[in-house]
Amino acid sequence: DAHKSEVAHRFKDLGEENFKALVLIAFAQYLQQCPFEDHVKLVNEVTEFAKTCVADESAENCDKSLHTLFGDKLCTVATLRETYGEMADCCAKQEPERNECFLQHKDDNPNLPRLVRPEVDVMCTAFHDNEETFLKKYLYEIARRHPYFYAPELLFFAKRYKAAFTECCQAADKAACLLPKLDELRDEGKASSAKQRLKCASLQKFGERAFKAWAVARLSQRFPKAEFAEVSKLVTDLTKVHTECCHGDLLECADDRADLAKYICENQDSISSKLKECCEKPLLEKSHCIAEVENDEMPADLPSLAADFVESKDVCKNYAEAKDVFLGMFLYEYARRHPDYSVVLLLRLAKTYETTLEKCCAAADPHECYAKVFDEFKPLVEEPQNLIKQNCELFEQLGEYKFQNALLVRYTKKVPQVSTPTLVEVSRNLGKVGSKCCKHPEAKRMPCAEDYLSVVLNQLCVLHEKTPVSDRVTKCCTESLVNRRPCFSALEVDETYVPKEFNAETFTFHADICTLSEKERQIKKQTALVELVKHKPKATKEQLKAVMDDFAAFVEKCCKADDKETCFAEEGKKLVAASQAALGL
C-alpha cells in the first residue's frame, strides 16, 4: 500500500515518542562520533518536518524517501569531513548508493571512551532533573557503540532502564536496588547486540537465502506444531524486518516488527501453545517475549523422514521442481524433530543433503546414489556433541576464569596475529559458554553452546574484517557461515608465526591495578597471558601456569604493600626476569 508521504505514514504508525527515539538511534548508528546535542538537534528538525507532512502529505519534500530525507539531514553536519574523513564522500552520491556508503562506514569498534558509570546519587539527580534527556542519552550512547543494535529491541531496553531508575531512585538503598538492574541490562544488552550483529552479518555477507535457512531451522524448532506454510510466512516476514533494521531502515523495521507480533498473536492457535502469556503484554514486551519464547512441544506423532526424503521415488523430481522449497521442507521437518541440535548443525545437515541431491540427481541411478545420505549425518552430529562434552568437562574442572585462560592460550596459538584486546575479548566470551550452557541437560547443551559460539565467533570476524591481519581468520570467517566454528576448532598452532619481540614495558604494572574491579584485574592478567603466548608460542601449559601463578602472587603482594608503587617497580623487574628464565626467552 503506497503512501503519498512515507515519513508521515511512519510517524502516524509509530507515534511521536517512538519516531523520535528511532530517528535518534538511526543517526547515532551512522554518525557515531557526533556529540549528543548535535544529534538531538537533527532529530528535532526531522520530527518537526514529519509533523508538517502529517498535517499535509502533499507539502514540499514530504514525498521523498526516508533515505533521502535522513541522508540529506546527515549531510548537513558541518564537521563531517574532519570528523569522519572519507565518509563525507558518501554525501556526493545519490540514493540508494549514499545509504549503502553510510552503511559501509559503520564501525563495530569505534574509538569512543569507555562508558563509566557515575555515582548512584548523581545518576538519580540527572534522571529527576530531565528524564527525557537522560533516556535519550542512554539510546545515543548504546546506539553509537553498537551500530547494528536491533532498534525496536533497544526501545525495550530503554523502557526497562527507565523503570529501573523510576523504582530505585525512590528506594531506601538506591545502589542496592539499581546497580544489579543496570548490570543485568548491560550484560543482556551486550548479548542482544552480538546476536543481532550475527543476523546482519548473515544477511550482508551471505545473503537472504542464508538468513532464511537460519530462520526456517530456528522457527521450526520453536514452533514444531506449525505447518510448513505458516513457518514459511513467518520466515518471510522476519527476514523483511531484519533486512530493514540491518539496512538502517529503522522506522520500517520497528513498524513491521509490530505487525509481525500482531499477526503471531492473532494466529497463535496455528503457531504455538507457548505464546499466550507473551501476547497479553504491551507491544515492546510482547515482541521481546515472542523472540525469546521457549520451544513448543513436538507433535505426538511425527513419522520418520526417510519416506519423503530418501525412499520416495519422487525425491529428485520434487527437488528439481522447486529446490529451495524442497530443501526448506527438509530443514523444517528435521528441525522440528530436533530441538536438541544447534541451528548451525541443522544447516550443515541440510547442506549435506543438498550436496548429495545435486550429485545424485544427475547420476544414472539417483536412488541408489542417495539411499545412504543420512549415514553422512552421523559424524556431523557427533563432532559438536563430543566437543561440547570435552569442553564442559574442562569447564567443570577449571571454573570460568581458568577455562577462559585455556581458551586464550588455545586461540592465541591458532591466530597469534590478531590484536591482544580482540583475543582477550573473544576468548573471555567463548569461555562464558561454560557457565551459560554446561549446566543444561544433554538435550539443551548443543543448541545453547554451538549457537552461542556462532555469535561470539562472529564478533571475531567483524572485528578482524576492520583490520585484517590473519589469512586463517579471513578463511574461517568467509568460506561458510555454518562451518565457522568447526573451521576455528580445526585450526592448529600457526607454525608460520614469528614470535613477537620481548618488550618489558608490556609486563610493567603499576599500583592502579589494585583499585580495579575483579573483572578488570582478570582482564589485565589475561592480556599479559596473551602477550606471553605471542612471545613464546611453543610455551607449555605448565610453563604458562607457573608464570601466571607468579604474576598473581606478585599483584597480591604489591597491592598489600605500604609503598605499592615501589613494590611494583622492584618486584616487577624480578618477575620479568624470572618469567624470561622460565620461558627461555
Epitope: 506423532d301 520418520s304 526417510a306 530441538p339 536438541d340
Partner: nanobody, 124 residues
Framework: EVQLVESGGGLVQAGGSLRLSCAAS????????MGWFRRAPGKEREFVAA????????YYADSVKGRFTISRDNAKKTAYLQMNSLEPEDTAVYYC?????????????????WGQGTLVTVSS
C-alpha cells in the same frame, strides 16, 4: 532418564516366531520414538524396526518387512517386536532403543537410551 530392559529372546526353529518386549522405567515413553536394532556375531549393529511416539507410524528395515511387527503400549511403558517366519540370518542380540528427538528412525545416533540386549538364536 530412561532404563530399558529387553526380554523374550531365546532359541527357535527356522520358520518359528518370537515376541520381544522392551520394558521402560523412569521417564514416560510416550515422548520417545522406540526402535529395535540387532547385532549378529562379527557384524555391525543394524536397524530392525521403529515406531513413532503414539504408534501411528512404523518403519522397518527391508530385510524384515512383512515378517516383523513393531508395536507399543504407552500405558504399560513397553514396546514389542513380533517376529514371524524367522530365518537363521535373524540370529543376533536384539537391542531396544529410545530416541527423544528421532528424525531418521534407522540411525543409531538418533537414539538416546539403550537396553542391554536379548539374544535370539534361529536354528535351521
Amino acid at each position: 532418564e530412561v532404563q530399558l530392559v529387553e526380554s523374550g529372546g531365546g532359541l527357535v526353529q527356522a520358520g518359528g516366531s518370537l515376541r520381544l518386549s522392551c520394558a521402560a522405567s523412569g521417564s514416560n515413553i510416550s515422548s520417545y520414538v522406540m526402535g529395535w536394532f540387532r547385532r549378529a556375531p562379527g557384524k555391525e549393529r543394524e536397524f530392525v524396526a521403529a515406531i513413532s511416539r503414539s504408534g501411528g507410524y512404523t518403519y522397518y528395515a527391508d530385510s524384515v518387512k512383512g515378517r516383523f511387527t513393531i508395536s507399543r503400549d504407552n500405558a504399560k511403558k513397553t514396546a514389542y517386536l513380533q517376529m514371524n517366519s524367522l530365518e537363521p540370518e535373524d540370529t543376533a542380540v536384539y537391542y531396544c532403543a529410545a530416541g527423544r528427538y528421532s528424525a531418521w528412525y534407522s540411525q543409531s545416533y538418533e537414539y538416546d537410551y539403550w537396553g542391554q540386549g536379548t539374544l535370539v538364536t534361529v536354528s535351521s
